[in-house]
């Protein structure tokens, strides 16, 4: 068996004392001594600390600046920061979500593989053979070419990744 080699998990060493850290939501006012306990104070309005700590100042809640397209997704508490997200049609430029950009549209020839969210951009994919997209859109998937046969028609003009096939009546003289 070995003797102890450190303070316990929620403690810190100061002046030979293992003092309790302050709980999340509280900041350090004074270290413990042989006769006194660690003194902690709750964080103020619009402040937080999210870990056991010995910080003398709480952190300010993040500000979701509407001028940058941001809005509050989750209001901060004394133990958690505010979480920002982007307005409809926009997404965050980084994980920290400090600013927003407009969702990207998929050009003709490309369809939406995954619709954008507040934190991720639109994911586009090229329309494969048999599919097309003739619009620039943040929502539209690639559409399948029209099946002329099911309408008792024939292909008059082949489809591309940007255009649908053109169907026409069957040539009766070929009967």
């Amino acid at each position: 068996p070995e003797p102890p080699t450190a303070c316990r998990e929620k403690q810190y060493l100061i002046n030979s004392q293992c003092c309790s850290l302050c709980q999340p939501g509280q900041k350090l006012v004074s270290d413990c001594t042989e006769f006194t306990e660690t003194e902690c104070l709750p964080c103020g309005e619009s402040e937080f600390l999210d870990t056991w700590n010995r910080e003398t100042h709480c952190h300010q809640h993040k500000y979701c600046d509407p001028n940058l397209g941001l809005r509050v997704q989750q209001k901060g508490t004394s133990e958690t920061d505010t979480i920002c997200t982007c307005e409809e049609g926009w997404h965050c430029t980084s994980e920290a979500c400090e600013s927003c950009v407009l969702h990207r549209s998929c050009s003709p020839g490309f369809g939406v593989k995954q619709i954008a969210t507040g934190v991720s951009d639109t994911i586009c994919e090229p329309c494969p053979v048999g599919f097309f997209s003739n619009v620039s859109s943040a929502f539209e998937k690639c559409h399948p070419w029209t099946s002329c046969e099911t309408k008792d028609l024939v292909v008059q003009q082949a489809g591309t990744n940007k255009t649908d096939v053109v169907c026409g009546p069957q040539d009766r003289l070929r009967a």
Partner: antibody, heavy 125, light 107 residues
Framework: QVQLVQSGAEVKKPGASVKVSCKAS????????MYWLRQAPGQGLEWMGW????????NYAQKFQGRVTMTRDTSISTAFMELSRLRSDDTAVYYC??????????????????WGQGTTVTVSS | DIQMTQSPSSLSASVGDRVTITCRAG??????LNWYQQNPGKAPKVLIH???SLPSGVPSRFSGSGSGTDFSLTISSLQPEDFGTYFC?????????FGGGTKVELK
């Protein structure tokens, strides 16, 4: 000031269980381990185990394994010790005590700096 | 578990006497030793830690010494409030273990 206040005396029959509480005040309850000890009449002190009030992790003395359960409720800063299958030789004063690690002359050591007033448990048929 | 042996188990003394209690550890515990005082019907309280350090507020008539396996607690001039039981405790390893106690009675 720092205080540990224990529940009142108990009289139990052999085979029964007893649950003793220890309410902490004056310090950050989850920040320090809580020890439970007992002292039989006219005897020395015997360590039963500890609980980490933050995580709920426990470490029981081998002698009490399977019979003792230590729990806590951080919302009311209270630790609990339950001893089951009581026998007459479990008659003792049960104490909770806060573990206070210190650092001195290049090494760490643990001591029990604050104690509850003790809870007398009598096991008798 | 580390066995702690305390002697004597009891002693009778008068106010003003010099009293020494010894404690022996079953293995080397360096200086990881605490002394506790217990008055009748009360919980123990820390007297000396580790081995020789006197917490503030404990009268200077108390002193501790030793390291390794042999330790002692000395009261240079016994006072009326000093009568009670004294325990040594090793904090070198888990489980912490105590000596059997020394009861200091009035002669």
């Amino acid at each position: 000031q720092v205080q540990l206040v224990q529940s009142g005396a108990e009289v139990k029959k052999p085979g029964a269980s007893v649950k003793v509480s220890c309410k902490a005040s004056g310090y950050t309850f989850p920040g320090y381990y809580m020890y439970w000890l007992r002292q039989a009449p006219g005897q020395g002190l015997e360590w039963m185990g500890w609980i980490n009030p933050d995580s709920g992790d426990t470490n029981y003395a081998q002698k009490f394994q399977g019979r003792v359960t230590m729990t806590r409720d951080t919302s009311i800063s209270t630790a609990f010790m339950e001893l089951s299958r009581l026998r007459s030789d479990d008659t003792a004063v049960y104490y909770c005590a806060r573990e206070k690690p210190r650092y001195f002359d290049s090494f760490y050591y643990y001591l029990m700096d604050v104690w509850g007033q003790g809870t007398t448990v009598t096991v008798s048929s | 578990d580390i066995q702690m042996t305390q002697s004597p188990s009891s002693l009778s003394a008068s106010v003003g006497d010099r009293v020494t209690i010894t404690c022996r550890a079953g293995q080397n515990i360096s200086r990881h030793l605490n002394w506790y005082q217990q008055n009748p019907g009360k919980a123990p309280k820390v007297l000396i830690h580790p081995a020789s350090s006197l917490p503030s507020g404990v009268p200077s008539r108390f002193s501790g010494s030793g390291s390794g396996t042999d330790f002692s607690l000395t009261i240079s001039s016994l006072q009326p409030e000093d009568f009670g039981t004294y325990f040594c405790q090793q904090s070198y390893s888990t489980p912490p273990t105590f000596g059997g106690g020394t009861k200091v009675e009035l002669k």
